[in-house]
């Protein structure tokens, strides 16, 4: 229904707290360099204006679109050109081009320092002094570093943060209460960020149809008892919600997501038997819970998929009649039978089925042609199954850090032109798949591994797009989203690469490394490992292991030495010489 004032409508629907949080997220995601105070001032102005529109929807400017209102606010910021360069040119455009321009200038890798968590005492003091400002800072800092973070979900994480601080700041040992809990939230939020970025990439590069196919597969796996019409309705609504969030329409997105959660809870009987626990929770927790609810029990009497999609005489007629509906039905039926497959795999199978029908239905004897299609799925299914087995075996043998190193070597060989920080970040993230997925029951491993890897590789592609350096990466990133992971997996050593010359300073370390947190130490060592591979792309695993063991021993010895500086300056050059010899 049309509202006289869009801003008043959203303020009324969302309530002041969520309204302000979402506006803050929106501004922080668009203008990533502005300080919290600058954004907080704008948010207050927008909120005050919204309240005047609630009081009188006919008041001046209350009928303007949200993009117009928000865009005008952003364009009124002083020193916009000095701070943001060509982003300021967006302000010369009219809506909707102006918003599109803002979206194009979102930076997936802003040059901001890592978000450092203050020590427990300081955190609790500022939280107690002003919880609202404290949480505002959290929203601002996360949103500007993750410009596509799913806004209503970020409100959920802020709420989690709030609850943890409320609980732990009352404890005697605040630090040991806060650290594991906040680490847990951070880990989940980071995964949520890359997953959502993947959804926005799907929407931006391949349109709503591609995202809707993803949603149909995912929802069919989770709700195998819902009929196709129900799944289609949920997928359509979910597509709208995600389109809005990816497009910067955060108020509409959060509002529609709340509506979708409400619909699901009111229609549990036709969707799933597993929703009640989620539906008993308050809004943010409810929507989050529904987004990761466990799969419903599969119906016991599902007929074989071949009946309708291979053996039926009407296959080509049904396909001709309504291609998208027929393929959608295939994806629904296949996905509800396979909660043990990744969504990426299910979409590859649907694509293979579509290609088979395109080819076969044009032949004189289609049934003879498409009759073997299900058998042709086998290699497509085996490939990711083997990937999971191989990688989980390796993870179990090496542990997370060793597994990350193995991936780092592999990916540096595949794309040695990519910057070392990007390779290290990617390998660390890809390596976490072991901890995240390899400990799960067998039937949950494949979906966990492949869909997580796809999201991480999407980030690799986004970073590479900014400064393309590797033909290998460009090739894999320019294909369809669901083919990316198999493409990266199939890459081998880049034979075109001219090895980097050996620079001693790259492998020269100082005593300051000894006081670094374990994570930072690992990153330093992994940086050195990537550089070694760039110097010797064809070094054997054995050679690299020898060098890295020597390196670890050197660090251990010098960090335990009475005179660390002297140890580093005398033993360091010896290490470099040994490394060169080992790799010769």
């Amino acid at each position: 229904e049309a509202h006289k004032s869009e801003i008043a409508h959203r303020y009324n629907d969302l309530g002041e707290q969520h309204f302000k949080g979402l506006v803050l997220i929106a501004f922080s995601q668009y203008l990533q360099k502005c300080s919290y105070d600058e954004h907080a001032k704008l948010v207050q102005e927008v909120t005050d204006f919204a309240k005047t529109c609630v009081a009188d929807e006919s008041a001046a400017n209350c009928d303007k679109s949200l993009h117009t209102l928000f865009g005008d606010k952003l364009c009124a910021i002083p020193n916009l050109r000095e701070n943001y360069g060509e982003l300021a040119d967006c302000c010369t455009k009219q809506e909707p081009e102006r918003n599109e321009c803002f979206l194009q200038h979102k930076d997936d890798n802003p040059s901001l320092p890592p978000f450092e968590r203050p020590e427990a005492e300081a955190m609790c003091t500022s939280f107690k002094e002003n919880p609202t400002t404290f949480m505002g800072h959290y929203l601002h800092e996360v949103a500007r570093r993750h410009p596509y973070f799913y806004a209503p979900e970020l409100l959920y994480y802020a709420e989690q943060y709030n609850e943890i601080l409320t609980q732990c700041c009352a404890e005697a040992d605040k630090e040991s209460c806060l650290t594991p809990k906040l680490d847990g939230v951070k880990e989940k939020a980071l995964v949520s960020s890359v997953r959502q970025r993947m959804k926005c990439s799907s929407m931006q590069k391949f349109g709503e149809r591609a995202f809707k196919a993803w949603a149909v597969a995912r929802l069919s796996q989770t709700f195998p008892n819902a009929d196709f019409a129900e799944i289609t309705k949920l997928a359509t609504d979910l597509t709208k919600v995600n389109k809005e969030c990816c497009h910067g329409d955060l108020l509409e997105c959060a509002d529609d997501r709340a509506e979708l959660a409400k619909y699901m809870c009111e229609n549990q009987a036709t969707i799933s038997s597993k929703l009640q626990t989620c539906c008993d929770k308050p809004l943010l927790k409810k929507a989050h819970c529904l987004s990761e609810v466990e799969h419903d029990t599969m119906p016991a009497d599902l007929p074989a998929i071949a009946a309708d999609f291979v053996e039926d005489q009407e296959v080509c007629k049904n396909y001709a009649e309504a291609k998208d509906v027929f393929l959608g039905t295939f994806l629904y039926e296949y996905s509800r039978r396979h909660p043990d497959y990744s969504v990426s795999l299910l979409l590859r199978l649907a694509k293979k089925y579509e290609a088979t029908l395109e080819k076969c239905c044009a032949e004189a004897n289609p049934p003879a042609c498409y009759g073997t299609v299900l058998a042709e799925f086998q290699p497509l299914v085996e490939e990711p199954k083997n990937l999971v087995k191989t990688n989980c075996d390796l993870y179990e043998k090496l542990g997370e850090y060793g597994f990350q190193n193995a991936i780092l070597v592999r990916y540096t060989q595949k794309a040695p032109q990519v910057s070392t920080p990007t390779l290290v970040e990617a390998a660390r993230n890809l390596g976490r798949v072991g901890t995240k997925c390899c400990t799960l029951p067998e039937d949950q491993r494949l979906p966990c591994v492949e869909d997580y890897l796809s999201a991480i590789l999407n980030r690799v592609c986004l970073l590479h797009e900014k400064t393309p350096v590797s033909e290998h990466v460009t090739k894999c990133c320019s294909g369809s989203l669901v083919e990316r992971r198999p493409c990266f997996s199939a890459l081998t050593v880049d034979e075109t690469y001219v090895p980097k010359e050996f620079k001693a300073e790259t492998f020269t370390f100082h005593s300051d490394i000894c006081t670094l947190p374990e994570k930072e130490k690992q990153i330093k060592k992994q940086t050195a490992l990537a550089e070694l591979v760039k110097h010797k792309p064809k070094a054997t695993a054995e050679q690299l292991k020898t060098v890295m063991d020597d390196f670890a021993q050197f660090l251990d010895t010098c960090c335990k030495a009475a005179d660390k500086d002297t140890c580093f300056s005398t033993e360091g050059p010896n290490l470099v010489t040994r490394c060169k010899d080992a790799l010769a």
């Epitope: 005489q313 009407e314 296959v315 080509c316 007629k317 396909y319 001709a320 009649e321 395109e358 239905c361 044009a362 032949e363 004189a364 004897n365 289609p366 049934p367 003879a368």
Partner: nanobody, 115 residues
Amino acid sequence: EVQLLESGGGLVQPGGSLRLSCAASGFVFSSFGMSWVRQAPGKGLEWVSSISGSGSDTLYADSVKGRFTISRDNSKNTLYLQMNSLRPEDTAVYYCTIGGSLSRSSQGTLVTVSS
């Protein structure tokens, strides 16, 4: 919506000829193989002939081979069946179908071969 409309049937003497047409709409005609099937009075459906989307590949039932010719005009979205040397056992309702479907989703056209 897919629509198939057959025409050209009628009464013909043994040894005579007929040309059946099938006008198609509601789908990309050239992307689909098409078939003719028939149903004689009191019998089940029988496949007669098929043609690929491009028209380059054709198949015939043994009972009509050498007598019937299937063809198509993709610019007119039309399928044809040229029937020569007709026999009494060719009497049936003829249907055009998409792909290899052995089913009736249209009205069909009646061919009667009788002296």
